[in-house]
């Protein structure tokens, strides 16, 4: 079974541009999590979904960040407008 699939693997953008990250969770998993990791702040949980419903988005209080999960097999994390301090590794994870 394929693991969690994210795209793009790398993204370079100019400040102020919109960035959209995509995630396909493991089939049959009903919880999906978006994390951000930086050297300065460590690993931060941004938002998680259960059965496609956002449960806790308190890790992204800036309304530049928005996440959606329109169905059980797809989620997006959007940053609009992006800022230099958004530079990080963004992880998607899923679980039963």
């Amino acid at each position: 079974d394929a693991g969690v699939i994210q795209s793009p693997r790398h993204e370079v953008t100019e400040m102020g541009q919109e960035v959209t990250l995509r995630c396909k969770p493991i089939s049959g998993h009903n919880s999906l999590f978006w994390y951000r990791q930086t050297m300065m702040r460590g690993l931060e949980l941004l938002i998680y979904f259960n059965n496609n419903v956002p449960i806790d988005d308190s890790g992204m209080p800036e309304d530049r960040f928005s996440a959606k999960m329109p169905n059980a097999s797809f989620s997006t994390l959007k940053i609009q407008p992006s800022e230099p301090r958004d530079s990080a590794v963004y992880f998607c994870a899923s679980s039963l």
């Epitope: 702040r41 460590g42 690993l43 931060e44 949980l45 941004l46 449960i55 806790d56 308190s58 890790g59 992204m60 209080p61 800036e62 309304d63 530049r64 609009q80 407008p81 800022e83």
Partner: antibody, heavy 117, light 106 residues
Framework: EVQLVESGGGLVQPGGSLRLSCAAS????????MHWVRQAPGKGLEWVSY????????YYADTLKGRFTISRDNSKNTLYLQMNSLRAEDTAVYYC??????????WGQGTTVTVSS | DNQLTQSPSFLSASVGDRVTITCRAS?????IYWYQQKPGKAPKLLIY???NLAPGVPSRFSGSGSGNEYTLTISSLQPEDFATYYC?????????FGQGTKLEIK
């Protein structure tokens, strides 16, 4: 009914410290981000700090970084603000507020901090 | 930091008047949020995501705008509406407030 009750304010000398508390009830505290906001006498609102539900994401007003520390204890349904090296300009009513509707949907009644010699 | 400037800072009006308060951001924001505060009381959320009324807020309040300029409108002032109003942005930390608009009885 959502309730937020601040405590810990009082009179403190310049250079001193205080720890404010915010006791939450009427909602699942561990599911919500929380803010501190302050209001100096006769002045407007000033955002102070934010902490996410699991304490992983924390933000501070630039002018307060290094002196103020936000924290929470989800087992006690309580939010804290540790304030060190207090100055006269920190004199204000300090409010805690719940993050909801993308904003601050519930506020406490406030606790007064006075920094004076 | 994104500076929010409200205008006017003071506004005198009468019961039944239509009033508009403007909030201008030094940098573009995605949404604006509005609060009402009465003397000696905590602020109360009025409008979120620019135009959505918070639960229990009367329909005479409305919000609109985009980019750098947003407005709060009260269609017909009631006695209980005389208070100070603040806008706030959450697009980028720090989450700044406007300086406030004090609405007084004429």
């Amino acid at each position: 009914e959502v309730q937020l009750v601040e405590s810990g304010g009082g009179l403190v000398q310049p250079g001193g410290s205080l720890r404010l508390s915010c006791a939450a009830s009427g909602f699942t505290f561990s599911n919500f981000g929380m803010h501190w906001v302050r209001q100096a006498p006769g002045k407007g609102l000033e955002w102070v700090s934010y902490i996410s539900s699991g304490s992983q994401t924390i933000y501070y007003a630039d002018t307060l970084k290094g002196r103020f520390t936000i924290s929470r204890d989800n087992s006690k349904n309580t939010l804290y603000l540790q304030m060190n090296s207090l100055r006269a300009e920190d004199t204000a009513v300090y409010y805690c507020a719940r993050r909801g509707e993308g904003a601050m949907d519930y506020w406490g009644q406030g606790t007064t901090v006075t920094v004076s010699s | 930091d994104n500076q929010l400037t409200q205008s006017p800072s003071f506004l005198s009006a009468s019961v039944g008047d239509r009033v508009t308060i403007t909030c201008r951001a030094s940098s573009s924001v995605n949404y604006i949020y509005w609060y009402q505060q009465k003397p000696g009381k905590a602020p109360k959320l009025l409008i979120y995501y620019t135009s959505n009324l918070a639960p229990g807020v009367p329909s005479r309040f409305s919000g609109s705008g985009s980019g750098n300029e947003y407005t709060l409108t009260i269609s017909s002032l009631q006695p209980e509406d005389f208070a100070t109003y603040y806008c706030q942005q959450f697009t980028s930390s720090p989450f700044t407030f406007g300086q406030g608009t004090k609405l007084e009885i004429k």
